[in-house]
C-alpha cells in the first residue's frame, strides 16, 4: 500500500507540476484511491472464486480404463493424402456417480417394467430377522453426465518443435529452423512451411514429403546451431484433437430404484442386501428378477450409472 | 550459373528493375539468394538478400532500405527493384548464391556469382 | 550494423613470398568468415569459408585463421597468378536486428 502512496503522489506531481495542492486536500485525495483500490481488489478476488467454481462445474475427470483393440483388415488407401495423417476417433461415455446415504439402498432389476411396478407401489414391508422394516421407493435422481467423441489426428507430415531457444529475430529463427530440419544428414528434409511462435519458443514444421517427419520423430531431440552453440530442441508428433457430438444427458434409471428407511437398522449390510433382494424377487412383492442390490448403513457409497 | 540482367543508362530519379535467373539449380533451403554491387573501381558493397526457402525472408543493408527490394519470381529467378537512382548507384550489380556449408547454417560462403551487370545514373 | 575493417589496403612481395591481410569484425562473428579474390573484369571467388575452410579447388597455399573479431588470410609461395584484390565478409544472425551482411573494404596484393 506505501508503494501505491508513492505512485499516486508521483502521478499527481507529474500532471500538476506548477500547482501545489495542499496537503490536506492530497491526503484525502489518496486516502480515496486506496479505498477504492481495496475495494476493486476485494471485487477481483469475488469474481476470481466465482470463476473457479464456474470452470469446476464444467470440468470432467474421467479414467477411461485400457480397451483392447481388434485388428481386422489392411486398407489400402487410394491417393497419398489419405497417408499423409493417421486418425482415430474414440467414444467416452462419463459414468454418472451416486451417493447412497446411510440408511438406503439401490436395488437393480433385470426388467425395466418391474423397477416401475416397484415404484408405482411406493410402500413396501420388508421382513428384516424380526423386524417388519418399511421402506420407501423412488426413482433414482441422477446428475448429468456427458457423452462425446474425442478425434485425434496425428500427422505424417508435420512435427512439433519446443524449448526453441529466443537467440534469433523471428524471422531470422524461422530461417534457421527452416535450414536445420531440410539437411538430410540428420533426417531432415525439403521443409513446405515453419510456423513459428517465439512467444511459446515453439514451431510447427511442414514436410513437402511423407516419412520425413518420422524419421526425425525416431528421436526426441534434434540439433539447432546457433552461432556455433548446440542448443537442442525437443521434436514431437503434431496431434490435432476433436471434440465431437457433445451432449449432456440427465435423467433417472429405468431399471434401479432408490430404497429408503432403514436408518435404524444395526447389522451386516451384506446381509440386509441379501434379504432385500429376497424380497423383491418375488411377484407377490411386486418384484421380479434381482441384478444387484447395494446396501449403506453406516458410510455412505458411491454407485456409478452408465448407459 | 547465375546470370544479371537489365542493367541499363538511366537518369538521376529514375527507376529500374535488375533480374537474376539460375540455372543448373533451382532455390532452396540451404540458400539465400542475393545481390552486391560495386562502384567502379571500388569495392564491394552488399545489397540485399532473400532467404530461398518457403518463408522467403528478406534483409537489407540499412542504406538500401526503402529505395531498394528484394523479391523472389519463381524457383529460379530474383529481382531487385531500385528507386530514386542517383549518381551514387552507378555500379556493377552482382547477383550471388550465399551458400550454407556446415549442417547447421553457421557457416556460409558467397560460392555462385553472376557475371553482372552495369547500371549507369547519369543526367 | 556489422562493419568489416580490412588491413592493409595494399600490399605487395615477391613471387615465392608471403603475405598476411587481416580483417576485423566490429563484434564477434564466431568464426563465420569467408575470404574472396577478385581479378578485373570478374566477379569474386570464395576461397575460404568457416575463417579456416579451404573452398574445393583453391590451393593449400591459402590460410585463413582467427576466431571472435579478429581473422587472417595468408598466401604463401606467391605465384603471379595471385595478383588481385582480396576481400573478407561475414554474414550474422541477431536477436536484435536484421540479419546482416558485410565486405571488408578490399586488400590490393601486387606480385613483384
Known amino acids: 500500500m506505501e508503494a501505491d502512496k508513492d505512485d499516486t503522489q508521483q502521478i499527481l506531481k507529474e500532471h500538476s507540476p506548477d500547482e501545489f495542492i495542499k496537503d490536506e486536500q492530497n491526503k484525502g485525495l489518496i486516502d480515496e484511491i486506496t479505498k477504492k483500490n481495496i475495494q476493486l481488489k476485494k471485487e477481483i478476488q469475488k469474481l476470481e472464486t466465482e470463476l473457479q467454481e464456474a470452470t469446476k462445474e464444467f470440468q470432467i475427470k474421467e479414467d477411461i480404463p485400457e480397451t483392447k483393440m481388434k485388428f481386422l483388415s489392411v486398407e489400402t488407401p487410394e491417393n497419398d493424402s489419405q497417408l499423409s495423417n493417421i486418425s482415430c476417433s474414440f467414444q467416452v461415455s462419463s459414468k454418472v456417480p451416486y451417493e447412497i446415504q446411510k440408511g438406503q439402498a439401490l436395488i437393480t432389476f433385470e426388467k425395466e417394467e418391474v423397477a416401475q411396478n416397484v415404484v408405482s407401489m411406493s410402500k413396501h414391508h420388508v421382513q428384516i430377522k424380526d423386524v417388519n422394516l418399511e421402506v420407501t421407493a423412488k426413482p433414482v435422481p441422477l446428475n448429468s453426465g456427458v457423452r462425446f467423441q474425442v478425434y485425434v489426428e496425428v500427422s505424417k507430415m508435420k512435427i512439433n518443435v519446443t524449448e526453441i531457444p529466443d537467440t534469433l529475430r523471428e524471422d531470422q529463427m524461422r530461417d534457421k529452423l527452416e535450414l536445420s530440419f531440410s539437411k538430410s544428414r540428420n533426417g531432415g528434409g525439403e521443409v513446405d512451411r515453419v510456423d513459428y511462435d517465439r512467444q511459446s519458443g515453439s514451431a510447427v514444421i511442414t514436410f513437402v514429403e511423407i516419412g520425413v517427419a518420422d524419421k526425425i520423430l525416431k528421436k526426441k531431440e534434434y540439433p539447432l546451431y546457433i552461432n556455433q552453440t548446440c542448443h537442442r530442441v525437443t521434436v514431437s508428433p503434431y496431434t490435432e484433437i476433436h471434440l465431437k457430438k457433445y451432449q449432456i444427458f440427465s435423467g433417472t434409471s429405468k431399471r434401479t430404484v432408490l430404497l429408503t428407511g432403514m436408518e435404524g437398522i444395526q447389522m451386516d449390510e451384506e446381509i440386509v442386501e441379501d434379504l432385500i433382494n429376497i424380497h423383491f424377487q418375488r411377484a407377490k412383492n411386486g418384484g421380479g428378477e434381482v441384478d444387484v442390490v447395494k446396501c449403506s448403513l453406516g458410510q455412505p457409497h458411491i454407485a456409478y450409472f452408465e448407459e | 550459373s547465375l546470370e544479371e540482367s537489365g542493367g541499363d543508362l538511366v537518369k538521376p530519379g529514375a527507376s529500374l528493375t535488375l533480374t537474376c535467373t539460375a540455372s543448373g539449380f533451382s532455390f532452396s533451403s540451404s540458400y539465400y539468394m542475393c545481390w552486391v554491387r560495386q562502384a567502379p573501381g571500388k569495392g564491394l558493397e552488399w545489397i540485399a538478400c532473400?532467404?530461398?526457402?518457403?518463408?522467403?525472408?528478406t534483409y537489407y543493408a540499412s542504406w538500401a532500405k526503402g529505395r531498394f527490394t528484394i523479391s523472389k519470381t519463381s524457383s529460379t529467378t530474383v529481382t531487385l527493384q531500385m528507386t530514386s537512382l542517383t549518381a551514387a548507384d552507378t555500379a556493377t550489380y552482382f547477383c550471388a548464391r550465399e551458400y550454407s556449408y556446415d549442417d547447421y547454417g553457421d557457416f556460409w560462403g558467397f560460392n555462385l556469382w553472376g557475371p553482372g551487370t552495369l547500371v549507369t545514373v547519369s543526367s | 550494423a556489422l562493419v568489416m575493417t580490412q588491413t592493409p589496403s595494399s600490399v605487395s612481395a615477391a613471387v615465392g613470398g608471403t603475405v598476411t591481410i587481416n580483417c576485423q569484425a566490429s563484434?564477434?562473428?564466431?568464426?563465420?568468415l569467408a575470404w574472396y579474390q577478385q581479378k578485373p573484369g570478374q566477379p569474386p571467388k570464395l576461397l575460404i569459408y568457416?575463417?579456416?575452410n579451404l573452398e574445393s579447388g583453391v590451393p593449400s597455399r591459402f590460410k585463413g585463421s582467427g576466431s571472435g573479431t579478429e581473422y587472417t588470410l595468408t598466401i604463401s609461395d606467391l605465384e603471379c597468378d595471385d595478383a588481385a584484390t582480396y576481400y573478407c565478409q561475414s554474414s550474422l544472425y541477431s536477436r536484435i536486428a536484421d540479419r546482416a551482411n558485410a565486405f571488408g573494404g578490399g586488400t590490393e596484393v601486387v606480385v613483384k
Open positions: 563484434q564477434n562473428i564466431y568464426t563465420n
Open positions: 532473400i532467404y530461398a526457402g518457403s518463408s522467403g525472408s
Open positions: 568457416g575463417a579456416s
